[in-house]
């Protein structure tokens, strides 16, 4: 758990020809507000899909009244922090929306009016506990400078705050694998995380990072039960037991691998890897030359002219193994970038892209808005293969050219007045009723 | 706060047994599992037992077979059974804990520790 924090520095024209002098008047003074929406990962900045790490809407700023002949000033701020709490890890890579609304305070009938002046929108990656990011960013004439960061709430810690520190009332009783938090002398931190994929019924660690097995488990992510046999006994020191697990009769028991050979279990039997020279299930062939042709799948022989020199099998791309037996797994590797699709074409491997990358390993990524414009203060977004726009409030369609008003279905009762609003409308009852809707 | 209490420990033959408890109080999230290390003098201190949520253990090859973990929920109180006890059984033993919000991964380092209580094993 912790917060994500947001520092507005300003808000203003910016640099350039055709800025705007303020987004006040001396008719209509104003004040700005804030409103920022997080989202996990590096997904799209569409403001109407969940804000699903949090969001959080600042105070009014002070009023602001432009003063004719003056020069264009920074605009007035909220005071304090935008805070978004968030429950659990902090995912390390984020997308952002800010937006800068205008709150307008003449003598509008129903009280003030809303309009969304600026949005901006971007994809950052931040560890949690570092230090304030500074970012400067432009959303048509207008600029936002802001910095930010992401803090651990105790007893979280860490770059994701998923490690627990505990308080200690003897900081130098830590135990092994921990360390004093700091700069809290009296707590101990615990690394929570063993190896990835380590079995969380059977496995444990000593060390971040190592998975140890519990009795009757093993294999390097405990995951393979030892053979178990009964040891109960009738009589003896053994009778006033329950039972106890040995390890029975395992398919590598007495090394079945011949000539040197070493034996690795597998699921169903087991496997010889067998020293140059002999091969065959129990490596029981042996004398093989380059003329008995031992290279598999166009490996080539070299060496080996009489039985008692070894022969060394040079394998092509694509097999290895003592005998060129072995087919590598190439895509295990998974050299496709950005969710590309790999092919093992045995010649070759291939990459099949995702719209909206390309190169031989879909390294490259497409400028999907290059060209593309979003109307009426909409934000281009890349994603997918095609642009799409996130638009401002009350504007909708591909390029933001449609009006979408909240307001047109009349969805205030009793003759209450409708208002678009951030977050949807706000209707402004008439005398004598309330509710969202003015129904009460 | 954890608050972790051995006792049980003291002087025995060799051949002889012994039996540790560790009661434990305070836990803020899920005891997860519950280690039993010890430390000779000069010596590192190594893990003996483990003891995880679901009953699964661990021993260290030097006890496999002479010493056996168990917890008591109910009471919320680790065990140690020591038999067979050899001179180089003879250490400070210490129990410690793993706790954490869910018990969903494998059984991390401990958390909490206790202050030990004396093993010594005479030939």
């Known amino acids: 758990a912790g917060v994500f924090e947001l520092q507005i520095h300003s808000f203003g024209p910016g640099p350039g020809p055709g800025a705007p002098r303020s987004p006040c008047s001396a008719r209509l003074p104003c004040r700005l507000f804030f409103r920022v929406c997080l989202k996990p990962g590096l997904s799209e900045e569409a403001a109407e899909s969940p804000c699903a790490l949090g969001a959080a809407l600042s105070a009014r700023g002070p009023v602001y009244t432009e003063q004719p002949g003056a020069p264009a000033p920074d605009l007035p701020l909220p005071d304090g922090l935008l805070q978004v709490p968030f429950r659990d890890a902090w995912p390390g890579t984020f997308s952002f929306i800010i937006e800068t609304w205008r709150e307008e305070l003449g003598d509008q009938i129903g009280g003030p009016a809303w309009s969304l002046l600026a949005r901006v929108a971007g994809r950052r990656r931040l560890a949690a506990g570092g230090p304030w990011a500074r970012d400067i960013q432009r959303a048509g004439a207008w600029e936002l400078r802001f910095s930010y960061r992401a803090r651990c709430e105790p007893p979280a810690v860490g770059t994701a705050c998923t490690r627990l520190c505990r308080p200690r009332s003897a900081p130098s009783r830590c135990g092994p694998g921990l360390r004093p938090c700091a700069p809290l002398e009296d707590e101990c931190e615990a690394p929570l995380v063993c190896r990835a994929g380590c079995s969380p019924e059977h496995g444990f660690c000593e060390q971040p990072g190592e998975c140890r097995c519990l009795e009757g488990w093993t294999g390097p992510l405990c995951t393979v039960p030892v053979s178990t046999s009964s040891c109960l006994s009738p009589r003896g020191p053994s009778s006033a037991t329950t039972g106890c697990l040995v390890p029975g009769p395992g398919p590598c028991d007495g090394n079945p691998c011949a000539n040197g050979g070493s034996c690795s279990e597998t699921p169903r039997s087991f496997e010889c890897t067998c020293p140059r020279g002999f091969y065959g299930l129990r490596c029981e062939v042996s004398g093989v030359t380059c003329a008995d042709g031992p290279c598999f799948n166009g490996g080539l022989c070299v060496g080996g002219a009489d039985p008692d020199s070894a022969y060394i099998c040079h394998c092509p791309p694509g097999f290895q193994g003592s005998n060129c037996e072995k087919r590598v797994d190439r895509c295990s590797l998974q050299p496709c970038r950005n969710g590309g699709l790999c092919l093992d074409l045995g010649h070759a491997l291939r990459c099949r892209c995702r719209a909206g990358f390309a190169g031989p390993r879909c390294e490259h990524d497409l400028d999907d808005c290059a060209g593309r414009a979003c109307a009426n203060g909409g934000t281009c977004v890349e994603g997918g293969g095609a642009h799409r726009c996130s638009c401002a409030l009350g504007f909708g369609g591909r390029d933001c050219r449609e009006r979408a008003d909240p307001c047109a279905a009349r969805p205030c009762a009793h003759g209450g007045r409708c208002y678009a609003h951030f977050s949807g409308l706000v209707c402004a009852c008439a005398p004598g009723y309330m509710g969202a809707r003015c129904e009460f | 706060q954890v608050h972790l209490v051995e006792s049980g420990g003291g002087l025995v033959q060799a051949g002889g047994s012994l039996r540790l408890s560790c009661a434990a109080s305070?836990?803020?999230?899920?005891?997860?599992?519950m280690r039993w290390y010890r430390q000779a003098p000069g010596k590192a201190r190594e893990l003996v037992s483990l003891?995880?949520?679901?009953?699964?253990?661990y021993y260290a090859d030097s006890v496999r077979g002479r010493f056996t973990i168990s917890k008591d929920n109910a009471k919320n109180t680790l065990y140690l059974q020591m038999n067979s006890l050899k001179p180089e059984d003879t250490a400070m033993y210490y129990c410690?804990?793993?706790?954490?919000?869910?018990?969903?991964?494998?059984?991390?380092?401990?958390?909490?520790w206790g202050q030990g209580t004396q093993v010594t094993v005479s030939s």
């Open positions: 003891i995880n949520s679901s009953g699964g253990t």
């Open positions: 410690a804990a793993y706790q954490a919000k869910y018990c969903s991964g494998p059984c991390a380092p401990p958390t909490d």
């Open positions: 305070g836990f803020t999230y899920s005891n997860c599992c």
